[in-house]
């Protein structure tokens, strides 16, 4: 018995179906086919779980969280024992193993391994201003999304005709910050943060209004 090489890893957007491949060759009839799918969740590597089981011509549910979401892609028994997972969740991310036995065919590689990563687009980021908006001050524009896998990168841009930040600005795309030094009237305006990763984009807006000093009345 020989389980074929798997593609290594699969990426899928949260909520979308995933197909985890596992095929094998055997010299024996499929009368005694036994297939166990296991997962080692990324979130809990010490606690492997059973996903689905095929034994004695019957299918059995694995862990409760997979109930109603998992099944074999084809009619069993077959040499293609790939499974689907519907409505993928973040907690489905992990390393999946298919263990195949088909007596009396013994020997060879009877395990296939596939990684599954469930991707999450950036959630609507939160935009805020840190620091005084008085003319001549330094301000920091902050942007962060609570969710996003892979981790989002952040790009700030100014929504005026030039489509760019003022020359006194420096930005950190990883942290989602922009520091604008020595703000002036030219720094005022609408700023947009674009949070993006491999599967999505989300934005927030911030209105920076630089405050000019009020003329003081003398006497």
């Amino acid at each position: 018995l020989e389980v074929s090489e798997s593609p290594g890893s699969i990426q899928v957007a949260r909520g979308q179906p995933a197909v985890l491949p596992c095929t094998f060759t055997t010299s024996a009839a499929l009368i005694n086919l036994n297939v166990i799918w296991m997962v080692t969740p990324l979130s809990n590597a010490n606690q492997p779980e059973q996903v689905i089981l095929y034994q004695g011509g019957q299918m059995f549910d694995g862990a409760p969280r997979f109930h109603g979401r998992v099944g074999f892609t084809g009619t069993m028994p077959a040499t293609n024992v790939s499974i689907f997972i519907n409505n993928t969740q973040l907690s489905d991310t992990g390393t999946y193993q298919c263990l195949v036995n088909n007596l009396p065919d013994i020997g060879g590689r009877n395990i296939g391994v596939t990684g599954l990563t469930v991707l999450v687009p950036p959630s609507a980021p939160h935009c805020q201003i840190q620091g005084s908006q008085d003319i001549g001050s330094d301000v920091i524009l902050l942007c962060s999304s609570e969710e996003g896998i892979p981790r989002p990168t952040y790009l700030w841009e100014k929504l005026d005709n030039t489509l760019k930040l003022p020359p006194t600005a420096t930005q950190d795309q990883v942290q989602g910050t922009v520091t604008i030094r020595n703000i002036s009237a030219l720094s005022s305006g609408l700023y947009q943060c674009v949070a993006s990763n491999a599967i999505g984009t989300s934005t927030c807006l911030l209105d920076l209004q630089v405050i000019s000093p009020q003329p003081r009345n003398i006497g």
Partner: antibody
Framework: EVQLLESGGGLVQPGGSLRLSCAAS????????MSWVRQAPGKGLEWVSA????????YYADSVKGRFTISRDNSKNTLYLQMNSLRAEDTAVYYC??????????????WGQGTMVTVSS | ASVLTQPPSVSAAPGQKVTISCSGS????????VSWYQQLPGTAPKLLIY???KRPSGIPDRFSGSKSGTSATLGITGLQAEDEADYYC???????????FGGGTKLTVL
């Protein structure tokens, strides 16, 4: 080396399509606004389109609006111009240009060598 | 025709001074910054002036820029043969969110 390199130009029939690419190197592409500028044979410069850092915001000249689409892939440091429903008057050298981060106003401080687009039957 | 008006051509002798005007309106030059470009025959344009009057590094101080109201001016002193080229102004318009070049001026060094 800091440079912009355009490609994708050529001869196309009226009504046809072309996709221009501009490969950037030597600077932080994702933190730079980018534009396409064209020059018809013997004529002056004409700004075509601009894209913000992320490509989320885009501007177009009236002459190409609805026919051309600017986009960028920051992971590949590349700017694109998808040109559809091409007309004879779109015949020009197309330049990719970087907008200076040192300027408040629009200021193209780095240009590609240009790629020729000829629309003719 | 461009919304920014430049003289089609200007000429002067070597060593002389020349100015090139760029005339617009309140919706473009009047409320926005102007940049200037030099284009030698068969080459890509080169930035000479940005933000009305600033020079990028490497641009000699023979080149200067200014803006007054709805017009901008490029000045070139100590004219040299290699200054013979086409010159363009550029700004943007607030209304249409578009960038706009002037029609260009051909400088001939006599």
């Amino acid at each position: 080396e800091v440079q912009l390199l355009e490609s994708g130009g050529g001869l196309v029939q009226p009504g046809g399509s072309l996709r221009l690419s501009c490969a950037a190197s030597g600077f932080t592409f994702s933190q730079t606004a980018m534009s396409w500028v064209r020059q018809a044979p013997g004529k002056g410069l004409e700004w075509v389109s601009a894209a913000s850092y992320s490509g989320y915001s885009t501007y177009y000249a009236d002459s190409v609006k609805g026919r051309f689409t600017i986009s960028r892939d920051n992971s590949k440091n590349t700017l694109y111009l998808q040109m559809n429903s091409l007309r004879a008057e779109d015949t020009a050298v197309y330049y990719c240009a970087r907008d200076s981060r040192d300027a408040y106003g629009v200021a193209f401080d780095l240009w590609g060598q240009g790629t020729m687009v000829t629309v003719s039957s | 025709a461009s919304v920014l008006t430049q003289p089609p051509s200007v000429s002067a002798a070597p060593g002389q001074k020349v100015t090139i005007s760029c005339s617009g309106s309140s919706s473009n030059i009047g409320n926005n910054y102007v940049s200037w470009y030099q284009q030698l025959p068969g080459t890509a344009p080169k930035l000479l002036i940005y933000d009305n009057n600033k020079r990028p590094s490497g641009i000699p101080d023979r080149f200067s820029g200014s803006k007054s109201g709805t017009s901008a001016t490029l000045g070139i002193t100590g004219l040299q043969a290699e200054d013979e080229a086409d010159y363009y102004c550029l700004t943007w318009t607030g209304a249409g969110r578009i960038f706009v070049f002037g029609g260009g001026t051909k400088l001939t060094v006599l």
